[in-house]
């Protein structure tokens, strides 16, 4: 059983990378002297208590920054937020912390990240770029939900 987070880099199909700006993740075109975030991810250890065939349930954080991605409702709208949280603290909890979990599905080189707390809502970036990461139900329209995840070993 892997009980340390794996590290990875993410870009979307338009070759935009994730950058941390004022405690918000945004997707921007890769440029010189830019510091894309390194993702930390770890599978939930209570996988048997979650839905099967939806993907691998993972906690997603920013490597070395004690920040994790989570989903919460603002009004009636599920939103993507960054919270100060140790990813291993989430991993070790006695139950899945669903607000911080995502079903990671891979199809070829493409990865999607579906909220466990809000099924049908996916991490996305606006096709325009330079915008914050969001959650969307609208697949393949104005938002990009397919990402390339490259593991760093």
């Amino acid at each position: 059983k892997i009980d340390t987070p794996q590290r990875g880099s993410i870009q979307d199909i338009n070759h935009r990378v994730w950058v941390l700006q004022d405690q918000t993740l945004i997707a921007v075109p890769r440029k010189d002297r830019m510091s894309p975030v390194t993702i930390a991810l770890i599978s939930c250890r209570h996988v048997e208590t979650l839905e099967k065939d939806r993907g691998n349930p993972i906690y997603l954080g920013l490597n070395g920054l004690n920040l994790c991605l989570m989903c919460a409702k603002v009004g009636d709208q599920p939103t993507l937020q960054l919270k100060e949280k140790d990813i291993m603290d989430l991993y070790n909890q006695p139950e899945p912390v669903k607000s911080f979990l995502f079903y990671h599905s891979q199809s070829g080189r493409n990865s999607t990240f579906e909220s466990v707390a809000f099924p049908g809502w996916f991490i996305a970036v606006s096709s325009e770029g330079g915008c914050p990461l969001i959650l969307t139900q609208e697949l393949g329209k104005a938002n990009t939900t397919d990402f390339g995840l490259t593991m760093l070993f």
């Epitope: 979650l50 139950e95 607000s99």
Partner: antibody, heavy 121, light 109 residues
């Protein structure tokens, strides 16, 4: 206001089955885990198991595997505990409780007032 | 299966500090046991106090605190009040299941 309303007392015969209910108000059971706990007279608490009402997955204490069945109906915001092949050992008060994550940990934050089950011929 | 042991009864006075403990038959209690503490008052009135060893549940008075003392989980009430008279149960996680202790009857005289 968050409340867990449990069904009324039951008197049942040995060998029978019973289904106890726990109806939540003030929150959606799909957003949390629902736990069931047994308390016998002059004894401590025993964890029976839990259900994730959003997807129906369950966990049981090994002692209650086969004895207890946990289900939930999200449309009525209700969790259920079914006990089968009842014996006098099942005479107890049964509680439902919400086990919720807030900030940095899981807590038993709200409890029902219990359902008294008496098994007697 | 693990057995969780608590003091059967303790007595304290208003304003005093009292510590209740929770021992595991499998060895030292650690943060991996995610100790929970629950209060039971008459007429089946339960309230969750502590989760994850030392995290107070929302709305719980600051006089209640959880910790590890030696090889046990502990609940400390700093400045006990008469309304704290109750039975206190601890519960410890062992992998995928939860085990409750027998409870401590706290009297505040």
């Amino acid at each position: 206001e968050v409340q867990l309303q449990q069904s009324g007392a039951e008197l049942v015969k040995p060998g029978a089955s019973v289904k106890l209910s726990c109806t939540a108000s003030g929150f959606n059971i799909k957003d949390t885990y629902m736990y069931w706990v047994k308390q016998r007279p002059e004894q401590g608490l025993e964890w029976i198991g839990r259900i994730d009402p959003a997807i129906g997955t369950t966990r049981y204490d090994p002692k209650f595997q086969g004895k207890a069945t946990l289900t939930a109906d999200t449309s009525s915001n209700t969790a259920f505990l079914q006990l089968s092949s009842l014996t006098s050992e099942d005479t107890a008060v049964y509680y439902c409780a919400r086990y919720d994550y807030s900030g940095s940990s899981f807590y038993f934050d709200y409890w029902g007032r219990g359902t008294t089950l008496t098994v007697s011929s | 299966q693990a057995v969780v042991t608590q003091e059967s009864a303790l007595t304290t006075s208003p304003g005093e500090t009292v510590t209740l403990t929770c021992r595991s038959s499998t060895g030292a209690v650690t943060t991996s046991n995610y100790a929970n503490w629950v209060q039971e008052k008459p007429d089946h009135l339960f309230t969750g106090l502590i989760g994850g060893t030392n995290n107070r549940a929302p709305g719980v008075p600051a006089r209640f605190s959880g910790s590890l003392i030696g090889d046990k989980a502990a609940l400390t009430i700093t400045g006990a009040q008469t309304e704290d008279e109750a039975i206190y149960f601890c519960a410890l996680w062992y992998s995928n299941h939860l085990v409750f202790g027998g409870g401590t009857k706290l009297t505040v005289l």
